[in-house]
């Protein structure tokens, strides 16, 4: 990815998805009526013209927001503490790796807009999730809907990371 982002970053992202899956507490079949359109900004992760700064900024903001969401008293009351601690640790490691890379990318002169724009968009998206949880009084089903939504958005974001990595491999081999 153009910096010393460890190869195991992708593995850590997959581990985060596995942990989020393991955190399930109730059957999602009980929660169908609580579905909500959080309007995940798909265009941010679906593009073919991927800039390193954009990809890293999206991943960084995504992980930062997930960390914040699952690092609250409400979250501690809702989830298994052992799994929550593992999630915090994994997210913290990934954030450290990404911060190192972002500093390098900015040093290489990539556009600041490519970094600030995704961050603002994702903050609005996560604010919608927080509002929903509050509206639903942090019910088990609300948390279950949020858990599945975050799994989906993280899956799409890590796919974007994989696409950039394979693009870099193709360029390196040509």
């Amino acid at each position: 990815l153009g910096c010393d982002l460890p190869q195991n970053h992708g593995l850590l992202s997959r581990n985060t998805l596995v942990l989020l899956h393991q955190m399930r507490r109730i059957s999602p079949f009980l929660c169908l009526k609580d579905r909500r359109d959080f309007r995940f900004p798909q265009e941010m992760v679906k593009g073919s013209q991927l800039q390193k700064a954009h990809v890293m900024s999206v991943l960084h903001e995504m992980l930062q927001q997930i960390f914040s969401l699952f690092h609250t008293e409400r979250s501690s009351a809702a989830w298994n503490m052992t799994l929550l601690d593992q999630l915090h640790t994994g997210l913290h490691q990934q954030l450290q790796h990404l911060e190192t890379c972002l500093l390098q990318v900015v040093g290489e002169g990539e556009s600041a807009g490519a970094i600030s724009s995704p961050a603002l968009t994702l903050r609005r998206y996560f604010q919608g999730i927080r509002v929903y949880l509050k509206e639903k009084k942090y019910s088990d089903c609300a948390w279950e809907v949020v858990r599945m939504e975050i799994m989906k958005s993280l899956f799409l974001s890590t796919n974007m990371q994989e696409r950039l990595r394979s693009k870099d491999r193709d360029l390196g081999s040509s």
Epitope: P28, F29, D34, D37, E144, F155
Partner: antibody, heavy 121, light 107 residues
């Protein structure tokens, strides 16, 4: 390209067992639920049940609870619908379809081609 | 269970006609309503989801409206390929339920 491919038509006798399949490809199989829908000859659509392939959690329509079993093998991206003892009234076309779970996305956006099950003595 | 009632159960129309099919739920389901088209010997095809969102690849002559208990599928100008059976389905809660279908035939 997203595809759900179902196993072929079956002709069975009353009392026999049967397991039909639905193989998903072109998407993350564990990110979607798989539902099963029955259509008896000349009749409408009836929802039978659904499975979350990520952990094989299931939900059934009360009309089909105890009559059929839904299962999945995520290692081969395949969902199953099975009967332990078929009846003539099980004669129908059976469809599988994918469902986005709790995500806000189109329900049953992709369907299998259907498996015709004929039960006759 | 939530009962879904479609009307009419069948209708005859000509190419170019505006066709309206209604679906009523036995309790409020918000906008959790889908519409499918099925042709003989084929699997159903999703047309409209969440009451009014057009599924990708579906012609814009199809539209959906409604919320709560009353929903409508409209075909603005019927085409030869639109002669089929149409089903509504609630996705608000389990068990998921379908309407009994509306068969659109050539007049």
């Amino acid at each position: 390209e997203v595809q759900l491919v179902q196993s072929g038509a079956e002709v069975k006798k009353p009392g026999e067992s049967l397991k039909i399949s639905c193989k998903g490809s072109g998407y993350s199989f564990t990110s979607y639920w798989i539902g099963w829908v029955r259509q008896m000859p000349g009749k409408g659509l009836e929802w039978m049940g659904i499975i979350d392939p990520s952990d094989s959690d299931t939900a059934y329509s009360p009309s089909f609870q105890g009559q059929v079993t839904i299962s999945a093998d995520k290692s081969i991206s395949t969902a199953y619908l099975q009967w332990s003892s078929l009846k003539a009234s099980d004669t129908a076309m059976y469809y599988c379809a994918r469902h986005p779970g709790l995500n806000w996305a189109p329900d049953f956006d992709y369907w299998g081609q259907g498996t015709l099950v004929t039960v006759s003595s | 269970d939530i009962q879904m009632t479609q009307s009419p159960s069948s209708l005859s129309a000509s190419v170019g006609d505006r066709v309206t099919i209604t679906c009523r739920a036995s309790q409020s389901i918000g906008k959790s309503l889908n519409w499918y088209q099925q042709k003989p010997g084929k699997a159903p095809k999703l047309l409209i989801y969440f009451a009014s969102s057009l599924q990708s690849g579906v012609p814009s002559r199809f539209s959906g409206s409604g919320s709560g208990t009353d929903f409508t599928l409209t075909i603005s100008s019927l085409q030869p390929e639109d002669f089929a059976t149409y089903y509504c389905q609630q996705s608000y809660d389990f068990p998921l339920t379908f309407g009994q279908g509306t068969k659109v035939e050539i007049k």
